[in-house]
């Protein structure tokens, strides 16, 4: 593995980020701020890229499937949370197929820097960004009900994930700005059609003294819809990410329907993840246990066909689920929990100024801002053996109650050598079915003077496609030294976030 010039791999970095965005099922499109590091390795006729990308969340939902640079700033003026991130990415390209970049794996960490950037020395904090977005599901439901009254096409949509919640307090009242994804849940789905997803932005206004959030004085909502039938694999891996998922044998193209607009509504655009309080449920029940009762349960795993199981399925909470090796010395290839909790019960900060909500939580219960050399977490194992569920063409979100006995896909795919999947306490291992690819891991908000902790770098081994020795892993350990001709320059637009990124990596 050799260091390379950050500016030389810009096309690969830009394409890789697009592929990562297209793989994600929730959250907001990442936009590239800077290539922080770049190495490459040549294996036969394949180039393996090891990239470190500094990113920032846009205000466009990943469901839009837009290219990251095509996310226009919205026309409306809503409080926009500034969330930065860093992604470690492994991608490959075959020399004879110059366009054929594939993202093999990625790990990202993200964190809000809004409060760290706010100068609140002489002034009250009037804008809050809430981490515990799930608390505002009622407001999202109320807003969606209003939208349904004005838009018959939305009659069968239900709230899926609450993505962002901001509160603004002003002289004339208080406003809550709630972003959430929605999902079409038609009553009759035989034969089952792919789910249609949407994204809504609701503004709810209350009198200054209002204690009851049930009855806003004013409610404005706008939604747009994204139809996977007209979409580039919203339901799974887009081209160049592995084998595309199929719906009834048809690949989908990449256009979106125009936004639904109520008569006389504003082009109102426009900026976390739910987590439980209390111990996490046993792994087999996790998918269906958090949040309010169905139909307002967790967002879905993406449907998949069996042929694609060795590629990605997507987790529900930004931090995707991972399979775990049963070897206790190396239990977690990515060491990420899907539900962002503190199994050890420690809150990452004793107190966050201006933030009175629970934060997305850190899996080991320790302050996320201490650096772990080489991207490793301080614990050598996961306290809970969470594993991915691999539903047979089906996922359970706001639409479906989960069946008692879930089928698994990938029959006939044995585990990769040495891989077993833990089922949790007392359950014993069972064969590995699907390896999860990629994770986005939300950390608590950064404070002034803190920098974003580096993402994990200990990716599992993978065989290169078209390789002579498919069982021989071809990726090297992710490079820890920084390339001399890196990092690249920050792209213009948000120079003030540069202070939150490390400029060098641990040697």
């Amino acid at each position: 593995v050799s260091p390379t010039d950050c500016s030389a791999v810009e096309p690969e970095a830009e394409k890789a980020l697009d592929l990562i965005n297209k793989r994600r099922r929730d959250g907001y499109l990442f936009q590239l701020l800077r290539i922080a590091d770049a190495h490459l390795d040549r294996v036969e006729n394949t180039t393996v890229y090891y990239l470190v990308l500094d990113v920032q969340e846009s205000d466009c939902s990943v469901l839009s499937r837009k290219y990251w640079n095509d996310c226009e700033p919205p026309d409306s003026r809503r409080p926009s949370e500034i969330v930065i991130g860093q992604c470690k990415v492994i991608a490959t390209r075959h020399s004879h197929e110059s366009q054929d970049l594939r993202v093999i794996d990625f790990n990202c960490t993200t964190s809000s820097v809004s409060s760290a950037l706010a100068n609140t020395k002489d002034s009250p904090v009037l804008i809050d960004f809430f981490e515990d977005t799930e608390r505002y599901r009622k407001q999202a439901n109320k807003a969606l009900e209003k939208y349904k009254e004005e838009n018959d096409d939305f009659a069968s949509f239900r709230v899926d994930r609450i993505e962002r919640v901001a509160r603004v307090r002003g002289g004339e009242g208080t406003g809550y700005f709630v972003d959430f994804s929605v999902r079409n849940c038609p009553r009759h789905h035989f034969p089952r059609h792919p789910n249609v997803f949407g994204f809504c932005r609701a503004d709810l206004f209350y009198d200054v003294e209002a204690l009851d959030l049930e009855s806003p004085k004013n409610l404005v909502i706008n939604c747009e819809v994204f139809d996977p039938q007209e979409h580039e694999n919203i339901n799974g891996v887009p081209p160049h990410l592995g084998h595309p998922f199929h719906w009834g044998g048809h690949e989908r193209s990449s256009t979106t329907k125009p936004p639904f607009k109520p008569h006389g509504s504003r082009d109102h655009h426009h900026p976390h993840k739910p987590h439980e309080h209390g111990p996490p449920p046993p792994p087999d029940e996790r998918d269906h246990s958090h949040g309010p009762p169905l139909p307002q349960g967790p967002p879905p795993l993406l449907p998949m066909s069996c042929s694609s199981c060795q590629h990605a399925t997507f987790g529900t909470n930004g931090a995707q689920r991972h399979s775990h090796n049963n070897n206790s010395s190396d239990l977690h290839p990515h060491k990420h929990h899907s539900h962002e909790q503190h199994p050890h019960g420690h809150h990452p900060h004793a107190h966050h100024p201006h933030e009175h909500d629970t934060h997305r939580q850190h899996p080991h219960g320790h302050h996320p801002h201490g650096h772990h050399p080489h991207g490793h977490h301080p614990h050598g194992h996961h306290p809970h053996g969470h594993h991915p569920h691999c539903h047979d063409f089906q996922d359970y979100g706001p639409c479906d109650p989960p069946p008692h006995n879930q089928g698994h896909c990938c029959h006939g795919h044995g585990p990769p050598p040495g891989h077993l999947r833990r089922r949790g306490p007392g359950k014993g291992p069972r064969p590995f079915h699907c390896r999860q690819i990629g994770s986005v891991y939300r950390l608590p908000p950064l404070r002034k003077g803190e920098v974003l902790p580096l993402p994990e770098a200990n990716f599992p081994s993978f065989p290169l496609p078209h390789h002579k020795h498919p069982l021989k892993p071809d990726n090297q350990p992710f490079p820890q030294s920084v390339s001399e001709s890196c990092p690249g320059k920050f792209k213009s637009g948000f120079p003030q976030v540069s202070m939150f990124f490390t400029h060098t990596f641990p040697k």
Partner: antibody, heavy 118, light 108 residues
Framework: QVQLQQSGAELMKPGASVKISCKAT????????IEWVKQRPGHGLEWIGE????????NYNEKFKGKATFTADTSSNTAYMQLSSLTSEDSAVYYC???????????WGQGTTLTVSS | DNVLTQSPAIMSASLGERVTMTCTAS???????LHWYQQKPGSSPKLWIY???NLASGVPARFSGSGSGTSYSLTISSMEAEDAATYYC?????????FGGGTKLEIK
């Protein structure tokens, strides 16, 4: 309490440039859009554009693109509007205002009178 | 651009008289995004009525606002001397945000 304090009146020659300032106090300057509005006698109020100081993001009314340029300094909580290639048409009172996030402008500066005359 | 036309441009009213002024938009505006500002000579505009019908803090109850779509109005139930000012309507529905030309209200 929230206040927007604008720089004093300016008398400029045609073709020159001028930079008007708007100092904000009493709130988190970086988090709210600063709006710029032009008022000429008999022409009512015209929205020029806006800047979000925390990010430097700007939006301009098409009509004022090339005429106005917005900047902001978060260390001094001050927003600036530079007007270039001045003509008599630019003679007006210029206001900065804060966007409330409730779809209206809740606080206004006292205005800066610009006179362009040879 | 959404052009807002206010009428009348100038009006005078006796003390105690009921006053109504209108604001007509060239394209539809959601009521959440239509506001009124009051401006007195030598002063900055002040938010007066927001989202069509809500009085800003400190605005007397004799003021009211109504309307929908392209037609909005501001009404004073009983004119008082301090109400003499210019009133501007403003839409924040679609950029560029626009203002009406103003209605100047004088005391007769």
């Amino acid at each position: 309490q929230v206040q927007l304090q604008q720089s004093g009146a300016e008398l400029m020659k045609p073709g020159a440039s001028v930079k008007i300032s708007c100092k904000a106090t009493g709130y988190t300057f970086s988090s709210y859009w600063i709006e710029w509005v032009k008022q000429r006698p008999g022409h009512g109020l015209e929205w020029i554009g806006e800047i979000l100081p925390g990010s430097g993001r700007t939006n301009y009314n098409e009509k004022f693109k090339g005429k106005a340029t917005f900047t902001a300094d978060t260390s001094s909580n001050t927003a600036y509007m530079q007007l270039s290639s001045l003509t008599s048409e630019d003679s007006a009172v210029y206001y900065c205002a804060r966007y409330s996030y409730f779809y209206y402008f809740d606080y206004w500066g006292q205005g800066t009178t610009l006179t362009v005359s040879s | 651009d959404n052009v807002l036309t206010q009428s009348p441009a100038i009006m005078s009213a006796s003390l105690g008289e009921r006053v109504t002024m209108t604001c007509t938009a060239s394209s539809s505006v959601s009521s959440s995004y239509l506001h009124w500002y009051q401006q007195k000579p030598g002063s900055s505009p002040k938010l007066w009525i927001y989202s069509t019908s809500n009085l800003a803090s400190g605005v007397p109850a004799r003021f009211s606002g109504s309307g929908s779509g392209t037609s909005y109005s501001l009404t004073i139930s009983s004119m008082e001397a301090e109400d003499a000012a210019t009133y501007y309507c403003h839409q924040y529905h679609r950029s560029p945000w626009t203002f009406g030309g103003g209605t100047k209200l004088e005391i007769k």
